[in-house]
């Protein structure tokens, strides 16, 4: 992005690039390879128990591993700020034996005008200011350093970047007399990367830019810019990849149209259209060139921006994402669902599945949920018998074998995992749903009936009797 130099203050130059990327210097730890689970697939529990016991026995060797927390670092360049002008920052847990870096962008919706930004500032100030951030955070899910919670990348250097710019990580405007708030999401990412170069990122082999919800969309908007930034700073050997969780939205027609009054009721296209202007939002250059001036909002939608990206990106998206339903004015309040709404929801799943057909690395379970990768139980959901950490491991392998996303999938190691069953929670490994009145867990059959699905219509396409289907669903098959 232009003007990047203005963010570099004297005495804050990144370290010079290493002379060679070949082998680590003597005495430096050699990066471990990703675990290949293929041989142990049938006996995963016993294998994980062995990994856990090995990890626990090695813990005393490394005091740093005993502390699960990521530690807060406010940016040294205090001109890169949160909405209220307080310095942005990041939480870091180094893993000195690893050349993998995971940078996670937090989510948390957005605001797009003075009124709803004021309301956000009054009720969600942690998402607009760093003034009260805790000194440490615990890494969970993909940010966990425990192999049993994070079989994928437990040994990586973990970075959590709090979302305090309310701009879907796209803004490039500072606070001024005219602007009540700063929107610097895109600049925060650039500055965090720059400061991390001095903390070991310079020796990285892989940088995985991940994020959930607005952070997931932030990945799509920023991954190529991070790769370009590292290249310009003299680190072309760092492989930059993206992992976008729950940030792949559709600019579809709302179930019930409402005026654009606040964050929740505003149609996604209109919210982003207004937001881009308010935030001075920036989008990936190659995507921007595909649309006319004033039409940059298109690049916030995964299926439009993805084909323009150069970095490999893995897309994780629930087929029935709750945030998508929220902006579409679908509020599932526990009342039985009418047919019109049921068809709308089914169609949403169908449309989403369609947008992922040309995304080679994707994981899309047919569940009604939102966000997954920093949940502690992110390993539980499976698509076609494959868990998300396993799919990510397969993706790593496919990228290891060819620097571009491999067209021929590895045998027994799938990366394109999109559920094909057509209704919410038809995948028995979906997160548990509870009855909103009683709080009781519901099985899939109860949930579908609660959603107003007629078991006859559901069973027919599967070539089953309703009673057979109910039996299967109740048994979690």
């Amino acid at each position: 992005s232009e003007g990047r130099k203005t963010w570099r203050r004297r005495g804050q130059q990144p370290p010079p690039p290493p002379r060679t990327e070949a082998a680590p210097a003597a005495g430096q730890p050699v990066e471990s390879f990703p675990l290949d689970f293929t041989a142990v697939e049938g006996n995963m529990d016993s294998f994980m128990a062995q990994v856990k016991s090995l990890a626990q026995s090695l813990y005393p060797c490394s005091a740093q591993q005993l502390n699960e927390d990521l530690r807060l670092h406010l940016l040294l360049n205090t001109s890169v700020t949160c909405n209220d002008g307080s310095p942005a920052g990041y939480y870091l847990k180094e893993s000195r034996g690893s050349r993998r870096w995971l940078l996670f962008l937090e989510g948390g919706w957005y605001c797009f005008n003075r009124e709803n930004c004021d309301s956000r500032y009054d009720t969600m100030r942690r998402l607009m200011s760093s003034r009260d951030w805790p000194r440490t955070r615990t890494g969970t899910g993909i940010l966990s350093s425990q192999p049993e919670e994070n079989p994928y990348w437990w040994n990586a250097n973990m970075v959590f970047i709090p979302y305090c710019s309310s701009d879907v990580w796209s803004g490039a405007s500072s606070k001024s007399e005219k602007n009540e708030y700063a929107f610097m999401g895109a600049l925060i990412i650039q500055e965090v990367v720059r400061e991390l170069l001095g903390r070991g990122l310079s020796g990285a082999k892989v940088l995985l830019l991940a994020g959930s919800s607005a952070g997931g969309t932030g990945v799509l908007l920023n991954v190529d810019r991070v790769a370009e930034q590292l290249e310009k700073l003299g680190y072309p050997a760092i492989q930059v990849r993206g992992l976008a969780d729950s940030g792949w939205f559709l600019d579809n027609k709302q179930y019930r149209h409402t005026d654009c009054v606040d964050t929740i009721t505003c149609a996604p296209t209109e919210a982003i259209r207004r937001g881009i202007r308010y935030w001075n939002g920036v989008v990936p250059e190659r995507c921007r060139r595909q649309f006319q001036e004033g039409e940059e909002w298109n690049c916030f939608f995964g299926y439009k921006v993805y084909p323009t990206l150069r970095c490999p990106v893995f897309v994780v998206q629930w087929l029935f994402d709750e945030a998508q339903l929220t902006v579409d004015n679908v509020h599932l309040t526990g009342q039985p669902v009418q047919e019109g709404l049921r068809l709308y929801i089914q169609n949403l799943g169908r449309e989403l599945r369609h947008t992922l057909k040309d995304v080679p690395a994707s994981f899309a379970p047919a569940c009604l949920s939102h966000e997954i990768i920093i949940r502690s139980h992110w390993t539980d959901v499976q698509v076609k018998g494959t868990s998300l950490p396993r799919a990510l491991h397969c993706w790593d392998r496919s990228l290891h074998d060819s620097h571009k996303a491999s067209k021929t999938p590895l045998k027994g190691c799938p990366v394109h995992l999109v559920d094909s069953c057509p209704w919410p929670h038809c995948n028995p490994s979906c997160p548990t749903v509870r009855d909103q009145f009683t709080g009781q867990e519901m099985n899939v059959a109860q949930f579908l009936m609660h959603m107003g699905f007629d078991m006859q219509t559901v069973a027919q396409p599967q070539g089953l009797e309703p009673s057979e289907l109910l039996g299967m669903l109740s048994n979690g098959s």
């Epitope: 009124e115 309301s119 500032y121 009720t123 969600m124 100030r125 929740i264 709750e322 509020h331 939102h370």
Partner: antibody
Amino acid sequence: DVQLVESGGGLVQPGGSRKLSCAASGFTFSSFGMHWVRQAPEKGLEWVAYITSGSGAIYYADTVRGRFTISRDTPKNTLFLQMTSLRSEDTAMYYCARSADGLDYWGQGTSVTVSS
Amino acid sequence: DIQMTQSPASLYVSVGETVTITCRASENIYSNLAWYQQKQGKSPQLLVYGATNLADGVPSRFSGSGSGTQYSLKINSLKSEDFGSYYCQHFWGTPFTFGSGTKLEIK
């Protein structure tokens, strides 16, 4: 030290009016959203009204919309709640509260009784 | 409007025990939830905001958890000063409704 002090409560006839005040000190009043919350005798908390920082946008609970008006006098660090067409069900302890992340400071409350 | 269903309505417990109070929203509130404690004749006090963040000065025996529509407040090894009423409140669009409250009483 942050302080919120409500005043203006008392006995009011049904259909009557009352204006509550909340004097704020110990913080930059203009930088925080301000709320009124009430609690009927032996009952739970009920959110009543909210005025944002900055733009001063205003929101009400359905039970009071059209009858109550929230306002703030920023130079005087004071929040107000003008109540009209009062009903017996408006009888409660009225609290003013400041918000940033949740309602982080509350006043001691002022009691309003609507009765003939 | 979003409804908040809090349970249980009352709890009889002894000092030293651990209790969990739950709050269910009628739709996803994306972790925009606060918990308050109110002692008899006093104003409420903020305990937790953003579903999991402890407010200043709140002892670490209190913890908030949850996401989506399901949230809970856990109090480990209860102290005598923890008895009183507890309320949840959402901040996901007005009206910012409260739960009906949970009264914690000494057994």
